[in-house]
């Protein structure tokens, strides 16, 4: 009752290995690392056969098939390149994930290299079987900003792509009778979130109650250059409108808000986020130069009353920008304390502008980002949001523009966006 001699499969072995097999002897067929036992088109780790009473084996010897990790999972905002010829996906094959540069960067500077493991899964040394994450790059416009002009009031036209984080926020409050329409600016922080001033998104009520406008009434335009031609821009509706819970209409303290977009926007040369600063109560240092862009008033001779009465007729068609120095806090406080009216400059604000006037942000620029270039990280960082100004017309002598100090709100912003700061390292100024 001896069974025929057994030949182990290619890339496999049989155990125990004996010269002769008799009735009731059993053998276990297994494969080398990176191969699987294949029997009747079913993959398994091992296969057992037995020598029968009539001197035959209970089954044919199975084959060993190389493990196949199959097509790797797609990476959002990423690409896959095959290191192995013929785009092989079998054991020990290698692939490399990369992000769509220059708009996305891999989290934690991961290599992106994955190897097909013996278990049939793509494995990375650090992330294991998890896919890498492509985060939006921030603060790096595709078109480099010009050497800052010495001297939006006193501003100049922005070339497309200079301020890829710039958002136009249009609010059409159809719940009001009659309907109410206004606009402001904002700054893209990620593919889904816009940073702006709370007063832009507060319902324009007849009392001082702070109530956000309904999300249905908010439209955000990104990649926009000329407001007369919105065809090339990305427009998005809002999924959420979040005002800072302590926003105070009486002194505009905590004038900061976020809009979550209904769908993430595709990033590109004209749509890229700006970086958030480090959490630092001091904010930007006095005399540092920053840039602000907006579609607000660009005529220095227009008074506030004329602006209000003429609706949107005094807007700039093309995005304007201006370069302004940060003003020492004490100097700004003094300049406002000398005016009639309640003009308190709090520690959550900073001022920017020139003593002699002529260059300023104005109505309609509200919520736009005051950005400063960080030499260390070589990125543009949003240090301020256009908040308020004096009673005189924009660009008046010794009337500085007042900005929300974004560095005081970094934790609040991350919290609202639902991202721990460690996960978004590239977004933080280094």
């Amino acid at each position: 009752n001896e069974c025929p001699e057994l030949q182990p499969p290619v890339h496999g072995k049989i155990e125990p290995s004996q010269a002769k097999y008799f009735f009731k002897d059993q053998v276990l067929v297994s494969c080398d690392t990176g191969y699987k036992v294949l029997k009747d088109n079913v993959e398994m780790d091992t296969f057992q056969i037995e020598c029968l009473k009539d001197g035959t084996w209970s089954n044919k010897i199975p084959t060993c098939k190389i493990v196949d990790c199959r097509a790797p999972g797609e990476l959002e905002h990423g690409l896959i390149t095959f290191s192995t010829r013929n785009n092989l996906t079998t054991y020990k094959s290698e692939i490399k994930y990369s992000c769509q540069e220059p708009y996305y960067k891999m989290l934690n500077n991961n290599t992106g290299i994955y190897t097909c493991s013996a278990q049939g899964v793509w494995m990375n040394k650090v992330l294991g079987r998890s896919l890498p994450t492509c985060l939006p790059e921030c603060g790096q416009p595709s078109r480099s900003l010009p050497s800052l002009v010495k001297r939006i009031i006193g501003g100049r036209n922005a070339e497309p792509g200079l301020f890829p984080w710039q958002a136009l926020i249009v609010v059409e409050d159809t719940s009001r009778v009659p309907n109410d329409k206004w606009f402001g600016s904002g700054a893209l922080l990620s593919a889904s979130w816009i940073l702006t001033a709370a007063h832009v998104l507060r319902s324009q009520r007849r009392d001082t109650t702070v109530i956000p406008v309904s999300k249905e009434h908010v439209t955000v335009y990104l990649g926009l250059h000329d407001v007369r031609d919105k065809s090339g821009a990305v427009n998005s509706s809002a999924a959420r409108v979040v005002l800072h819970p302590d926003f105070n209409i009486q002194n505009y303290n905590h004038d900061i808000a976020l809009v979550q977009l209904q769908e993430p926007v595709p990033l590109g040369p004209h749509v890229m986020p700006v970086c958030l600063p480090r959490l630092e109560p001091e904010g930007p240092a006095p005399h540092m130069l920053g840039l602000v862009a907006g579609w607000g008033i660009s005529n220095p001779n227009v008074t506030v009353d004329e602006i209000i009465s003429s609706g949107t007729r005094t807007l700039s068609d093309v995005l304007q920008y201006v370069k302004l120095p940060v003003v020492p806090h004490a100097e700004c406080k003094t300049s406002y304390e000398s005016r009639s009216g309640n003009y308190s400059v709090t520690e959550n604000m900073f001022c920017a502008g020139y003593y002699e006037g002529g260059k300023d942000t104005c109505l309609g620029d509200s919520g736009g980002a005051f950005v400063i270039f960080d030499d260390l990280s070589q990125r543009w960082v949003v240090q301020g949001l256009v908040s308020w100004g004096g009673p005189e017309e924009c660009g008046s002598k010794q009337v500085y523009g007042v900005y929300t100090k974004v560095s005081n709100y970094v934790d609040w912003v991350w919290e609202q966006m639902g991202l721990p700061q460690s996960v978004v390292e590239p977004q933080v100024e280094r």
Epitope: S175, V177, R206, T208, T209, I211, S214, I249, Q250, W388
Partner: antibody
Framework: QVQLKQSGPELVKPGASVKLSCKAS????????INWVKQRPGQGLEWIGW????????KYNEKFTDKATLTVDVSSSTAYMELHSLTSEDSAVYFC???????WGQGTLVTVSS | DIVMTQSPSSLAVSAGERVTMSCKSS????????????LSWYQQKPGQSPKLLIY???TRESGVPDRFTGSGSGTDFTLTISSVQAEDLAVYYC????????FGGGTKLEIK
């Protein structure tokens, strides 16, 4: 068109409670607050309180915090005001207003008498 | 609490005359940031519900005749009716909305 329709007159006994209603139509109920105002016979207007249907937030005139309770039923676009522990001082016409006072109800006369 | 004081408490004028009535608040109703005064004017005709005429001190509610004008800033406000009509017989109230809401005592306008 926008309308605020208030419930009919009420004759109630001292110490009792009464619940007045204000049904809104013709506008976005949840996006606009409802105010309640009291006017005693031959007297001026007195603000009682405010309710915002979208999130249910409420503000009261301190004088009325123990006297009035404001609620809304968003499904029927109706605002309610319940007045407690009624006395003759509560005999008045009560108005509701909406869309920041652009529209007013016709008023509900509450008479407190034994 | 903000106290609103209206004067005079009543006045009688002939049709076609110009009339002004005053409203003073115990504190400023101007918010410099919004450049708005949070004061409204209402008209209440006999046996009717109040009607909003003016908000933000000087903005006329839609449908209100242009003979009604609101002016003033800070603590002193005025409602002017440029040419009084018989149908303007009413009590006029001012109301602050700077901090919650407070109505003034009212000015009763009678037609001679």
């Amino acid at each position: 068109q926008v309308q605020l329709k208030q419930s009919g007159p009420e004759l109630v006994k001292p110490g009792a409670s009464v619940k007045l209603s204000c049904k809104a139509s013709g506008y976005t109920f949840t996006s606009n607050d409802i105010n309640w105002v009291k006017q005693r016979p031959g007297q001026g207007l007195e603000w009682i309180g405010w309710i915002y249907p979208r999130d249910g937030s409420i503000k009261y005139n301190e004088k009325f915090t123990d006297k009035a309770t404001l609620t809304v039923d968003v499904s029927s676009s109706t605002a309610y005001m319940e007045l407690h522990s009624l006395t003759s001082e509560d005999s008045a016409v009560y108005f509701c207003s909406g869309v920041e006072d652009s529209y007013w109800g016709q008023g509900t006369l509450v008479t407190v008498s034994s | 609490d903000i106290v609103m004081t209206q004067s005079p408490s009543s006045l009688a004028v002939s049709a076609g005359e110009r009339v002004t009535m005053s409203c003073k608040s115990s504190q400023s109703l101007l918010i410099s940031r919004t450049r708005k005064n949070y004061l409204s004017w209402y008209q209440q005709k006999p046996g009717q519900s109040p009607k909003l005429l003016i908000y933000w001190a000087s903005t006329r509610e839609s449908g209100v005749p242009d003979r009604f004008t609101g002016s003033g800033s800070g603590t002193d406000f005025t409602l002017t009716i440029s040419s009084v009509q018989a149908e303007d017989l009413a009590v006029y109230y001012c109301k602050q909305s700077y901090n919650l809401y407070t109505f003034g005592g009212g000015t009763k306008l009678e037609i001679k």
